[in-house]
């Protein structure tokens, strides 16, 4: 099946991006070529190439190919962003999982199945060997990664740095066990690319063998990236087109997974009375077509046959005999009892009104000129006229005036979270308008995020499940006090300001809260002499979806040794991967006797699209989101850790670059922590800091 | 090894008192809250109340304020739960257990439940 | 208060059967949910904290997912042990609620 044309499919695309090598040791190679196909070949079959092809870049300008050995995963390289620039990078090398024996495997694990350390192929200490990387080329029997050059039973193995022990197999998952979908698996964005019959996946951005319709180009939200596995059409479970000619398409082997809920992301807004959009959230109980007729029960074959069972299209609601749209139709419908009808549309379901029309803003809002005039929590927006100075204090150029017409919601500023406006309450005095981005609008309010542009310090100068106990320079750690007890972590940014998470709130009466600064100890024993107890005066909740809230004290705090504040990132800026930050908190540790003293885990930032693989696909991370893993397996934020700081370090200067949030689970081996991005955010935060009136101290 | 043990069964007049104890052992006991649920016959679980014993501090559900008094001795680490003006909807088998020293915690260690008959 | 509504109230199962739970809770309960097992006579004990966080020595047949309000709790192949009555609970508004309880009966 695998003929020279389709080796591209082995291959991981990523459009307009290139690899910058930042080691001058570092080896490539160039050739003036006209297809990316050509590129695919030469480095599949390492031809006339003084090393192991991993990766190589198309240049679509230049008609030139970069052909490298390494890939975007490899120390010493880079991404960048370059419009001409597509990157493709041998899957074999980037998978952490097998398929069949795993005779391609080309990962990096190097440890048994039983924790022993693999000895490197190089070498015949302690074991005597005769595979030799020249004598296997093309196995890439690199370093003392496990392998499998001869394709035997077990999997990939190794020669063990164990004298006792001769050789052990590796304990690497299959892909068919890794790789798992919720629902009928519409969502699902994997990197399954084999159908259950083991056939390899046509690439979606081809029509070789198999012509069809869903380019990606045409279809931007179906994430048809390189040859995976998708759902694009309402079929019982993910598929793909095949590289054999006689099979155009076939079904893959995907699981559901074990915690089979969907992602807010996934799930069409659920209505009961009328139709949002083509009605796939539709759940409401009209069980009628158009015209009175009443419709069949999903799981009922009589007197239609048909494949749209409860069974086949999990998470549809096919309950009853109710109308829906699980396939993705122009609008709920059903099979009908008529034997002479086979469907029809429930088109007397009532259209929802939706508020404020279809308004919507693109990139940042900039440039909306819609007529909405209320802030998200109900204010009537005040008179852009009448709030100049206060505009002016806050911006450091002249607005367009010519935009700025009576009270609607605007962006003078260029706020990255949308449009905004005065609401002439002096406790609320600006607030965003409920205005969403358009759908399908994915302009970056940051660019570049994931090149280290900026830097994030400003001057050159959780449970914590495993932590360890800290008392250094930890003066702006805040407990946040619900009835008398700990709820959760925040971070004093400001005399007046802790900042911490949407989720720490569950009343919403500010008498029932405290801030306690200075302590060490959860239940503040032992640190009477330094503790400060604050009152709440006001949440300021943080852009839609954002997750985060500025805590307004009802009196500054008072810094001292036990005090202090921390310092808030540059907006927009990128901390490199891999650097060592630290969260903190007073949450669950697991420990059967806790002494209740504030503890601390130590990870460090992965990249958003590792983070993603990690999540073994199941998340992908945004603009907002700042990834980190465990140092130490089996340490990381928990319940009562919530709203608490990641805590960087740059240049001698620490920040708080991500605030803890409920995620998915707690300390789960190898499943990297997100949380909210406070970068994304700083300029939100500053301009809360500016123009919310404090008391004095 | 983390233990909550309870005080034996009561049998009680309608309009009587009642006191129940929680002796624990096996962790510092001023440091977690403590936490007593009830279950009717047949029924199913319903939160009375905690203690912080280190403080003192207590949070009571509405339904309870006036019925449940809830006092912690340090000394000997034990906490205790007393029921006034009982009635006959009082019967139930009353349980302490261990929440966490932060809001929202699960209840990881029970006593084995001390049930209280009310009957003329 | 939040009433949380455990469903099925009953259930007959075999073991090795994979069986879930739900639990819907009348507000937004964030991820403060906890399952509890419970035999007759006995107190209940902790399997799930944190809506998904198996607790320390519970078999991993039991796992938890959900946040908001629903919530969901599967015993992927039943054993005999197993057979008992489930509580859901959430700590996240006073006052602390229960579901009213899943008994998982042998068919």
């Known amino acids: 099946q695998r003929k020279r044309r389709n080796t591209i499919h082995e291959f991981k695309k990523s459009a307009k991006t290139t690899l910058i090598k930042i080691d001058p040791a570092l080896k490539i190679k160039t050739k003036k070529v006209n297809t990316a196909d050509q590129c695919a070949n030469r480095c599949t079959r390492n031809k006339g190439l003084p090393f192991t092809c991993k990766a190589f870049v198309f240049d679509k300008a230049r008609k030139q190919c970069l052909w490298f050995p390494f890939n975007s995963m490899s120390s010493g390289v880079k991404k960048e962003f370059g419009h001409e620039f597509d990157l493709y990078e041998n899957k074999d090398y980037i998978r952490n999982c097998i398929i069949g024996k795993g005779r391609s495997y080309k990962g990096t694990v190097s440890i048994t199945k039983s924790g022993i350390k693999c000895q490197p192929w190089s070498s015949m200490i302690p074991h005597e060997h005769s595979f030799l990387p020249s004598s296997y080329r093309g196995k890439d029997l690199q370093e003392n990664y496990c392998r499998n050059p001869r394709g035997e039973e077990g999997g990939p193995w190794c020669f063990t740095s164990n004298p006792e022990v001769r050789y052990e197999v590796c304990d690497i998952p299959q892909c068919s066990e890794v790789e798992c979908m919720t629902c009928n698996g519409e969502s699902y964005r994997g990197l399954m690319d084999h159908t259950e019959s083991g056939k390899i996946c046509q690439r979606w951005d081809h029509q070789t063998p198999h012509r069809h319709k869903f380019l990606p180009e045409r279809y931007p939200d179906k994430g048809f990236d390189d040859n995976y596995c998708r759902n694009p059409d309402g079929q019982p479970r993910p598929w793909c087109y095949t590289l054999d000619p006689h099979t155009r398409w076939e079904y893959c082997a995907i699981k559901t997974c074990a915690d089979n809920t969907m992602n807010d992301t996934d799930v069409p807004l659920e209505t009961t009375e009328c139709i949002q959009g083509q009605g796939e959230g539709y759940r409401g109980t009209v069980n009628t077509i158009w015209n009175g007729i009443p419709c069949q029960r999903w799981d009922s074959q009589y007197p239609h046959e048909h494949d749209m069972t409860p069974e086949n299209f999990k998470c549809k609601d096919l309950r009853e005999n109710y109308c829906r749209n699980p396939d993705g139709s122009e609008s709920p419908w059903c099979f009908t009892t008529d034997p002479n009808i086979r469907v029809g549309y429930c088109s007397q379901i009532p259209n929802c009104d939706m508020s404020h029309g279809q308004d919507c803003y693109r990139g940042n809002g900039k440039n909306y000129m819609g007529n909405l005039s209320q802030t998200r929590s109900g204010l009537t927006c005040s008179m852009w006229d009448k709030n100049m100075e206060d505009l002016h204090r806050h911006i450091f150029w002249e607005p367009d005036a010519s935009k700025l017409n009576e009270n609607y919601c605007r962006n003078p500023d260029d706020d990255a979270h949308g449009p905004w406006c005065y609401t002439g309450n002096p406790l609320i005095p600006w607030d965003y308008c409920p205005i969403s981005r358009c759908e399908g609008d994915t302009t970056p309010t940051i660019v570049n995020l994931d090149h280290p542009v900026i830097s994030c310090a400003k001057t050159k100068q959780l449970r914590v499940v495993n932590g360890i106990p800290t008392r250094t320079n930890i003066g702006w750690m805040v407990s946040l006090r619900y009835r008398n007890k700990h709820i959760c972590g925040g971070s004093l940014i400001k005399e007046s300001w802790v900042l911490t998470a949407r989720q720490c709130f569950p009343s919403r009466d500010l008498k029932d809260y405290e801030a306690w600064l200075g302590i060490h100890d959860v239940h503040g024993r032992g640190d009477e002499k330094c503790k400060q107890v604050l009152n709440v005066s006001q949440l300021v909740y943080g852009p839609e979806g954002s997750d985060l809230v500025l805590m307004k004290l009802a009196r500054p705090a008072v810094l001292d040794d036990f005090v202090s504040t921390i310092d808030l990132p540059n907006y927009g800026c990128t901390i490199p991967e891999k650097t060592s930050c630290s969260v903190y908190g007073w949450g669950y540790t697991g420990l059967i006797n806790y002494d209740g003293l504030l503890r601390v885990a130590h990870l460090y930032i992965m990249g958003n699209e590792k983070c993603s693989q990690h999540h073994r696909g199941k998340v992908t991370l945004n603009e907002s989101e700042i990834c980190a893993g465990a140092e130490k397996i089996g340490s990381g934020p928990c319940e009562g850790d919530y709203g608490g700081p990641l805590v960087c370090e740059q240049h001698k200067m620490r920040m708080v670059l991500g605030v803890i949030v409920p995620g998915r689970g707690c300390a789960i081996p190898n499943r990297p922590g997100i949380f909210v991005r406070v970068a994304y955010y700083a300029k939100w935060i500053h301009k809360i800091i500016l123009t919310y009136k404090v008391p004095q101290s | 090894e983390v233990q909550l043990v309870q005080s034996g069964a009561e049998v009680k007049k309608p309009g009587a008192s009642v006191k129940v104890s929680c002796k624990v052992s096996?962790?510092?006991?001023?440091?977690?809250?403590i936490e007593w649920v009830r279950q009717a016959p047949g029924k199913g679980l319903e939160w009375i109340g905690e203690?912080?014993?280190?403080?003192?501090?207590?949070n009571y559900n509405e339904k309870f304020k006036g019925k449940a008094t809830m006092t912690a001795d340090t000394s000997t680490d034990t906490a205790y739960m007393e029921l006034s003006s009982l009635r006959s909807e009082d019967t139930a088998v009353y349980y302490c257990?261990?929440?966490?020293?932060?809001?929202?915690?699960?209840?990881?260690?029970w006593g084995q439940g001390t049930l209280v008959t009310v009957s003329s | 208060d939040i009433v949380m509504t455990q469903s099925p109230s009953s259930l007959s199962a075999s073991v090795g059967d994979r069986v879930t739970i739900t639990c819907k809770a009348s507000?937004?309960?964030?991820?403060?949910v906890s399952w509890y097992q419970q035999k007759p006579g006995k107190a209940p004990k902790l399997l799930i904290y944190g809506a998904s966080n198996r607790y320390t020595g519970v078999p991993d047949r039991f796992s938890g997912s959900g946040s908001g309000t629903d919530f969901t709790l599967t015993i992927s192949s039943l054993q005999p042990e197993d057979f008992a009555t489930y509580y859901c609970g959430q700590g996240y508004s006073y006052p602390y609620t229960f579901g009213q309880g899943t008994k998982l009966e042998i068919k």
């Open positions: 096996g962790y510092t006991f001023s440091g977690n809250w």
């Open positions: 257990a261990r929440g966490g020293h932060y809001y929202g915690s699960s209840w990881d260690y």
């Open positions: 507000e937004n309960v964030v991820t403060y």
């Open positions: 203690i912080l014993p280190g403080s003192g501090n207590t």
